[in-house]
């Protein structure tokens, strides 16, 4: 089955610049299918923009000047690129790539969509580092004792833009765990968000990861915040310094835990 | 030009109570098109639910039922037993792929219908309240309460800032909430909750233990090498009524 990944969760540009949005196709040969691009402007219907067929033929929605959007495909990387020239306020939207998932009969195809990339236009000069800054909270002893469960909370602050995705996994597992989250909130010129995960007592001795996708993550990779395995019987440490783990970095955690 | 018009902008549904979404076609006969339904959830993920001719996306067949009412020129999507996972915006869309005539493989979308999910009416349940701390940050975790109306107060004389609470449906069909704040005196911050004309304090849930009975990281699992900005842990301390972890990048 065809699967679409849009690695850029958001793309922030200043007026008149060019935005390039990527869509990676897997499970199907890109040269054997058509890739479609749609946009959803705030408050408007999702609208088809442009498509590129297996033979490179481009089809464009009639209302859009031909040079506004350019679509391409790179078979070597199985990627389709939507280029938006001369970005302006009207281009603020979420852009989705899509393809018809091959099934035997033409009438039985289904169109699958990528997760979307939000185009953000800003006139602000942003600080050098507007990636999410994590703070982690470990389960309170009261919760683990009384409810035989523990809640991990992952707080992310001082990021821009506001588009962020958070999910949780156990170490050495790709299964996404059921978590809950608050709304993204504005704090001065940046944003904050938190997500929490409640696990049963038997899972407390496993390492958990809060995985954060954001446009401004270091090296463009998902940031992994490590929550250490918990034992419900002893010791604390003094939290003086901290660090988080980008995809290839390691992490040392420093903890102070007692009953709450 | 054809237009797909949802019956409602917002549809509140209760967990387990069937709900029906309708979408009418203006300017054309619905029988000339294939109808599709999609759901967009938090984070913009667009998931295929249903396409005419009894085609369902993975995991949707058991809980969703799509239909076309030719006479009324509208498409129908029934959610048979809604759960909190079904919250999102639902879109109808049409195409004529494989129908002959003008070959249009692009989808024409209608505006979304926002489906909000609320727990079923149920006996009132008092919340559990726990405090989690890290440096100046304090989180008040309020678990498994019903009904939704709640006031969460982080009690402190030295508030830096507070954020609006997040209130969500719990997996068991009640409510959970978290309120965050920053305080100079975080060690002494407690949480009190007004719910159902009663007050519940985080201190009601504190476990009286000796100093060796604390949550701690498993030592063998916490020995990763530090990067340059990290320092080795200081000596072990025993601090009462604190639950902290600091991490900055």
């Amino acid at each position: 089955a065809g699967h679409l990944e849009q690695p850029q969760i958001s793309s922030t540009k200043t007026l008149s610049k060019t935005a390039r949005l990527e869509c990676v196709v897997s499970g199907i040969t890109i040269s054997a299918t058509s890739v479609y691009w749609y946009r959803e402007r705030p408050g408007e219907v999702i609208q088809f923009l442009v498509s590129i067929s297996y033979d490179g033929t481009v089809r464009k929605e009639s209302g859009i000047p031909s040079g506004k959007f350019e679509v391409d495909r790179i078979p070597e990387t199985s990627t389709s690129t939507l280029t938006i020239h001369n970005v302006e306020k009207q281009d603020i939207a979420t852009y989705y790539c899509a393809l018809w998932e091959a099934q035997q009969e033409l009438g039985k195809k289904i169109k699958v969509f990528g997760p979307g990339t939000k185009l953000i236009i800003t006139d602000k000069q942003l600080d050098a580092d507007v990636s999410p800054k994590p703070t982690i909270f470990l389960p309170s002893i009261a919760e683990t004792k009384l409810q035989k469960a523990g809640t991990y909370l992952c707080l992310l602050e001082k990021f821009f833009p506001d588009v962020i995705k958070i999910h949780w996994q156990e170490k050495k597992s790709n299964t996404i765990l059921g978590s809950q989250e608050g709304n993204t909130m504005k704090t001065n010129d940046t944003y904050m968000k938190f997500s929490w995960l409640t696990v049963p007592e038997k899972s407390l001795d496993k390492e958990h990861r809060c995985i954060v996708r954001h446009e401004n993550n270091k090296n463009g990779v998902d940031q992994e915040i490590i929550f250490p395995p918990i034992k419900t019987d002893v010791i604390t440490m003094d939290p003086k310094d901290n660090c988080s783990k980008d995809a290839n970095d390691t992490l040392l955690l420093q903890l102070t835990n007692t009953s709450a | 030009a054809i237009e797909l018009v949802p019956e409602h902008q917002t549809v509140p549904v209760s967990i387990g109570v069937p709900a029906t979404l309708r979408c009418s076609m203006k300017g054309e006969a619905i029988g000339n098109y294939y109808i599709n339904w999609y759901r967009k959830t938090q984070g913009n993920t667009m998931t295929f639910i249903y396409r005419e001719k009894d085609i369902y996306g993975p995991g949707f067949k058991d809980n969703f039922q799509g239909d076309i009412d030719i006479a009324k020129n509208l498409a129908v999507l029934k959610i048979l037993a809604p759960s909190e996972r079904d919250e999102g915006s639902y879109y109808c869309a049409c195409d004529t792929l494989g129908m002959g005539g003008e070959y249009t493989d692009k989808l024409i979308f209608g505006k979304g219908t926002r489906v909000t999910v609320e727990p079923r009416s149920q006996p009132h349940t008092k919340p559990s309240v726990f405090v989690m701390k890290n440096g100046t940050n304090v989180a008040c975790l309020v678990k498994e309460f019903y009904p939704k109306d709640i006031r969460i107060n982080l009690v402190s004389s030295k508030k830096i800032t507070e954020f609006d609470p997040a209130i969500v449906i719990s997996p068991s069909g009640k409510y959970n909430a978290v309120k965050l704040g920053k305080y100079e005196d975080s060690n002494s911050v407690t949480c009190s909750v007004q719910h159902d004309n009663k007050t519940v304090h985080s201190t009601d849930f504190e476990v009286k233990t000796d100093s060796t009975d604390h949550v701690k990281p498993k030592e063998t699992e916490n020995t990763k090498q530090p990067s340059k900005s990290c320092h080795k842990p200081k000596a072990i301390v025993h601090t009462e009524k604190v639950n902290m972890m600091s991490l900055t990048v």
Epitope: V50, I52, G56, V58, S62, I64, S66 | -
Partner: antibody, heavy 121, light 109 residues
Framework: EVQLVESGGGLVKPGGSLRLSCAAF????????MDWVRQAPGRGLEWVSS????????FYADSVKGRFTISRDNAKNSLYLQMNSLRAEDTAVYYC??????????????WGQGTMVTVSS | EIVMTQSPGTLSLSPGERATLSCRAS???????LAWYQQKPGQAPRLLIY???SRATGIPDRFSGSGSGTDFTLTISRLEPEDFAVYFC??????????FGQGTKVEIK
């Protein structure tokens, strides 16, 4: 049958103004982006300006930027080009054009017959 | 701005002969956005080829387009009397301006 008909051309002095119109027939005008392309006598084609279906996108060639204004009235199925501060080098046949078939990816498959603009003292 | 240069300026051929027209871009152009037009005296241009190699509706199959990157070619396999005209290439994909070549005139020898 889809048809584009230009009007409004004529003789004008340097520094003067002129407004060209393009009426569209047999087309759901409000769904299409529209363009102006000109051709000086004995010369090649030069793209002048482009406007989106709902006027949300407007582009100009550098040679006319600040002097020409493209606009449209979807209720009247009409496209306009307001030309101010005209120069001798603006003398040309002005065509309105559109990409009517979505298959063509933006190439101009429908053209008007053109209207002649002469800038001379 | 992408500059499109056509060669030759004029091509003198007889009916039945093969015509090869060249168009070179000053920088790489996606083949999906390269068009060829035919224009006869006193008439508006007519779209022949879009996407570098796809024929527009109603265009005879003696017209074919090829090329990629910066070099594109229009080939008329057997010239018919009605094919004697001026031919323009155009790139219409990158940010405006959408630029045309200066034209190649195909005349009867």
């Amino acid at each position: 049958e889809v048809q584009l008909v230009e009007s409004g051309g004529g003789l004008v002095k340097p520094g003067g103004s002129l407004r060209l119109s393009c009426a569209a027939f047999g087309i759901t005008f409000s769904s299409y982006s529209m363009d102006w392309v000109r051709q000086a006598p004995g010369r090649g084609l030069e793209w002048v300006s482009s406007i989106g279906s709902s006027s949300s996108y407007i582009f100009y060639a550098d040679s006319v930027k600040g002097r020409f204004t493209i606009s449209r009235d979807n209720a009247k199925n009409s496209l306009y080009l307001q030309m101010n501060s005209l120069r001798a080098e603006d003398t040309a046949v002005y065509y309105c054009a559109t990409s009517y078939s979505w298959n063509y990816g933006g190439a101009f498959d429908i053209w008007g017959q053109g209207t002649m603009v002469t800038v001379s003292s | 701005e992408i500059v499109m240069t056509q060669s030759p300026g004029t091509l003198s051929l007889s009916p039945g002969e093969r015509a090869t027209l060249s168009c070179r871009a000053s920088q790489s152009v996606s083949s999906s956005y390269l068009a060829w037009y035919q224009q006869k005296p006193g008439q508006a241009p007519r779209l022949l080829i879009y996407g570098a190699s796809s024929r527009a509706t109603g265009i005879p199959d003696r017209f074919s387009g090829s090329g990629s990157g910066t070099d594109f070619t229009l080939t008329i396999s057997r010239l018919e009397p009605e094919d004697f005209a001026v031919y323009f290439c155009q790139q219409y994909g990158s940010s405006p301006p959408y630029t045309f070549g200066q034209g190649t005139k195909v005349e009867i020898k």
